[in-house]
């Protein structure tokens, strides 16, 4: 079953290569277990950035080596991606699945264009 997912159109990463955005889904029921996946689309290639599952009201659990962190509040997921560089500029798509209880719902956002600008190196001071 399909579900609507909303996310901002554009986000600018900080000078430290950190970008945050909210992914909001219109839950048709009372989900207790949710899976969130962030995918990057660039040059028609789609790659998985990170994925997490969480029980409603609890923290998101990403893999240890994940570049993502996040928190949840109701039907909103606050996602933060770290370690971004200019080459990581692209469309970051939020995918939400309501895993339990049945029925299973799937929603895919339109994507957030994240722009990353590498900071200029500090000039040497004599």
């Amino acid at each position: 079953k399909a579900m609507h997912v909303a996310q901002p159109a554009v986000v600018l990463a900080s000078s430290r290569g950190i970008a945050s955005f909210v992914c909001e889904y219109a839950s048709p029921g009372k989900a207790t277990e949710v899976r969130v996946t962030v995918l990057r689309q660039a040059d028609s290639q789609v790659t998985e950035v990170c994925a997490a599952t969480y029980m409603m009201g609890n923290e998101l659990t990403f893999l240890d080596d994940s570049i993502c962190t996040g928190t949840s509040s109701g039907n909103q997921v606050n996602l933060t991606i770290q370690g971004l560089r200019a080459m990581d500029t692209g469309l970051y798509i939020c995918k939400v699945e309501l895993m339990y209880p049945p029925p299973y719902y799937l929603g895919i956002g339109n994507g957030t264009q994240i722009y990353v600008i590498d900071p200029e190196p500090c000039p040497d001071s004599d």
Epitope: A2, T37, L39, V46, E48, A51, I93, K95, L106
Partner: nanobody
Framework: EVQLVESGGGVVQAGGSLRLSCAAS????????MGWFRQAPGKEQEFVAD????????YYADSVKGRFTISRDNAKNTVYLQMNSLKPEDTAVYYC????????????WGQGTQVTVQS
Amino acid sequence: EVQLVESGGGVVQAGGSLRLSCAASGGTFSFYGMGWFRQAPGKEQEFVADIRTSAGRTYYADSVKGRFTISRDNAKNTVYLQMNSLKPEDTAVYYCAAEMSGISGWDYWGQGTQVTVQS
């Protein structure tokens, strides 16, 4: 045209095992993910398990965790569901599904295979 064909369903006694297979045919492709869903009569469709190509990462519904194992053979474009310690409540039609890319949703579905667990 991609086709998913399930096999391996049947009737089994509670506590028994079955191994479902789902073979993809119709072309050369690399799926982002493949998974299993089930639907019992008069009930909503339920997610069972899936596996993502990227890291071979697996995910299971709590109701089957520790009893079912999903695996895939990329060379054969086949996904398997090993079901152990079956319970009567596992009785359902099991459907295989495949995602071509992570942002396409479940693009392809099999026709389903019936699993009946007798007590």
